[in-house]
């Protein structure tokens, strides 16, 4: 028997660009908790029942108000450890899972509302009484650091917390054979009754005469190894080495969800669709009922009539998720069109719409041109929800109204001069040159690349532009 | 046009699982979110629930907890509705719906599902 | 759950005839109400949305009115393509839920 403890230090951004939104804001104060799942063995796939070793919930955190224009710092964190008390061997190797919740403080109706903010998961190694481990995890742009450890509570002691301590019979010495418990010293180990050779490092046992291997060995006596497939390759094509064939990348490949969990990928990665009475991103938590009060945010909950159904939860409106868990963002049913920004108001959805649209759901393209003349004979041009006018020779500006240059663009090829004419422009050409932007030279032997000016004009005369 | 190809009849036997496929075409796949509406023989309309074609986050009614799971292969614009450990009240036509902001307002042309020990 | 009643289930008429078909929601929904036909095929086809937008390609015969609970749905001039049940259904809140159907038929 023992406890393995967990000591959060910090939770906030992470290292590198698109640090986090605060969780929090003036608006909607919130605290944070922690919940920690321990499994043992190191393989994912495991057939223990989720959290074989124990869960536990940390107290709430001081309240957070977010500083209007502050980036994310560490939030404040509830005091205290985790513990996660076991009751049989220490396994050596687990597997946990850590999530940090946000309790919403702000005007809710039916109380607080919780909802996930992060979760990390790792499988490790560790023996019982060592120091405390330290890590570091991340989660999307969220990082948690932490510590852990295991320890044994008396009288067991060892990597396992199988051996027992049992008071000094003597004063000075431990019996024959035994020696002291350290750090007890004033303590003696208990006889051990385990079969004879089991490993004390790597065997334990409950009963005399047994021994009882941990994760990753086996044998009678605890001291083989188990031996690892020799496909530890990471995914990817099959390896001439090994021979294997690694499956190719899939998130739900070997199916992740535990209790009968169903995987189906997202775009981002998987989601177990749980058995009722299972919840938590792999289904690994379980045995929940009604008693249980499983169902958050004053959702009801109702008991199921056969192991399938073991409870639902029916969420009051705003809620939703098999424990009413996840406020509802009724911007997820994507409303707003045209790329309109969506704001859920709680009472209203309302979209913002983009330059060019309108319309509760921004489905209007408007009309630009409507009601919208373009001066001095130009015409109106639509595109994209802009408005702009082609305008009459002459003219310019957005609606037409500003006189143009029409020699500002300089439209006289190879050195002709512009002249303004009340109709456009006249080009008068370089020797050489013709055109009515003097664009073709005149051939060196008189024949135009045109065909021949029409009779009164002459190569090098100025060619008014109609 | 705007189209909604849904896969064919299915014949299960209770405990069984059927994954039904709903193809979008002549729209952006993921402008729009996708809805799952389930008719039993002779009975009315009940809505499901909904995914987020952007997010690939579901959102589920009550009734639907649990056995049922939307998802998404958005290279393909496809949605699916996947059905575990089907039960005889699981037998019924199953429509996939875009949701223009206002309504469902086009229909896959439904998928019957027939669950029979 | 708001729930979505039309009393009427199933209504018959002649060809040409006006017809209106009522649904009442149990609180108020904020005209978030729009209506489905169901062909005998079974293909589903929204009409009207948002109490009275007639939908993209409906013919115009089709129309819509209502408020706060009561609603309903009226074909000007009933003709043979018209023969369905019809399906009110509320889009306020979630859970999104139908009426149970009103299905007309040619007397």
């Known amino acids: 028997a023992g406890v393995f403890e967990l000591q959060i230090h910090s939770f906030g951004p992470g290292p590198g660009p698109g640090a986090p939104r605060s969780p929090c804001s003036a608006r909607l104060p919130c605290r944070l908790f922690f919940r920690v799942c321990l499994k043992p063995g190191l393989s994912e796939e495991a057939a223990e029942s989720p959290c074989a070793l124990g869960a536990a919930l940390s107290a709430r955190g001081p309240v957070y108000t977010e500083q209007p224009g502050a980036p994310a710092p560490d939030l404040p964190l509830p005091d205290g450890l985790l513990q996660v008390p076991f009751r049989d061997a220490w396994p050596g190797t687990f597997s946990f899972i850590i999530e940090t919740w946000r309790e919403e403080l702000g005007d809710q109706i039916g109380g607080p509302a919780w909802s996930l903010l992060a979760r990390v998961a790792g499988r490790r190694r560790l023996a019982a009484g060592g120091p405390w481990a330290r890590d570091i995890q991340r989660a999307g742009a969220w990082e948690l650091r932490f510590s852990y450890r295991a320890r044994c509570e008396p009288p067991a002691v060892g990597t396992a917390c199988t051996r027992l301590c049992r008071p000094r019979s003597a004063p000075s010495r431990c019996g024959p054979g035994l020696r002291p418990c350290a750090p007890l010293e004033d303590e003696c180990e208990a006889p051990l009754v385990c079969r004879a050779g089991c490993s004390p490092e790597h065997g334990f046992c409950e009963q005399p005469g047994e021994c009882r291997c941990l994760e990753g060995w086996t044998g009678p006596l605890c001291t083989v190894p188990v031996s690892t497939s020799s496909c530890l390759s990471p995914r990817g094509p099959s390896s001439a080495t090994t021979g294997c064939l690694v499956p190719g990348p899939g998130p739900c490949d070997g199916n992740p969800c535990a209790n009968g969990g169903s995987c189906s990928e997202t775009p981002r990665s998987f989601e177990c669709t749980c058995p009722r009475g299972f919840y938590g991103l792999r289904c690994e938590v379980s045995g929940v009922t009604c008693a249980d009060g499983p169902c958050f945010n004053g959702g009801l909950c109702v008991g199921g009539a056969d192991p399938d159904s073991a409870y639902i939860c029916h969420c009051p409106p705003g809620f939703q998720g098999s424990n009413c868990e996840k406020r509802v963002d009724r911007c997820s049913l994507q409303p707003c069109r045209n790329g309109g920004l969506c704001l859920d108001l709680g009472h209203a959805l309302r979209c913002r719409c983009r330059a060019g649209f309108a319309g509760p759901r921004c489905e209007h393209d408007l009309d630009d041109c409507a009601g919208r003349a373009c001066a001095n004979g130009g015409t109106c041009v639509e595109g994209g929800g802009a408005h702009r006018c082609s305008c009459a020779l002459g003219f310019g500006g957005r609606d037409c109204r500003e006189r143009a240059d029409p020699c500002a663009a300089r439209p006289c090829a190879h050195g002709g001069r512009c002249y303004a004419h009340f109709s456009g422009l006249v080009c008068a050409c370089a020797p050489g040159y013709m055109g009515a932007r003097c664009e073709f030279p005149v051939h060196p032997d008189g024949a135009s690349a045109l065909p021949a000016a029409p009779p009164g004009l002459r190569p090098g005369d100025p060619q008014r532009y109609l | 046009q705007i189209q909604l190809v849904q896969s064919g009849p299915e014949l299960k036997k209770p405990g069984e699982t059927v994954k039904i496929s709903c193809k979008a075409s002549?729209?952006?796949?993921?402008?729009?979110?996708m809805h799952w509406v389930k008719q039993a023989p002779g009975k009315g309309l009940k809505w499901m629930g909904w995914?987020?074609?952007?997010?690939?986050?579901?959102g589920y009614a009550d009734d639907f907890k649990g056995r049922f799971a939307f998802s998404l292969e958005t290279s393909a614009s496809t949605a699916y509705l996947q059905i575990n450990n089907l039960k005889n009240e699981d037998t019924a036509t199953y429509f996939c719906?875009?949701?223009?902001?206002?309504?469902?307002?086009?229909w896959g042309q439904g998928t019957s599902v027939t669950v029979s020990s | 759950d708001i729930q979505m009643t039309q009393t009427t289930s199933s209504l018959s008429a002649s060809l040409g005839d006006r017809v209106t078909i009522s649904c009442r929601a149990s609180?108020?929904?904020?005209?978030?109400l729009n209506w489905y036909q169901q062909k005998p095929d079974g293909t589903v086809k929204l009409l009207i949305y948002?109490?009275?937008r007639l939908h993209s390609g409906v013919p115009s015969r089709f129309s819509g009115s209502g408020s706060g609970t009561d609603y309903s749905l009226t074909i000007s001039n009933l003709e043979l393509e018209d023969i369905a049940t019809y399906f009110c259904?509320?889009?306020?809140?979630?859970?999104?839920?139908f009426g149970g159907g009103t299905k007309l038929e040619i007397k």
């Open positions: 259904q509320q889009g306020d809140m979630l859970p999104w839920t």
């Open positions: 002549g729209y952006t796949f993921t402008d729009y979110s």
């Open positions: 948002y109490t009275s």
């Open positions: 719906a875009r949701y223009d902001g206002y309504a469902m307002d086009y």
């Open positions: 609180q108020d929904h904020s005209n978030h």
């Open positions: 995914i987020n074609t952007e997010t690939g986050e579901p």
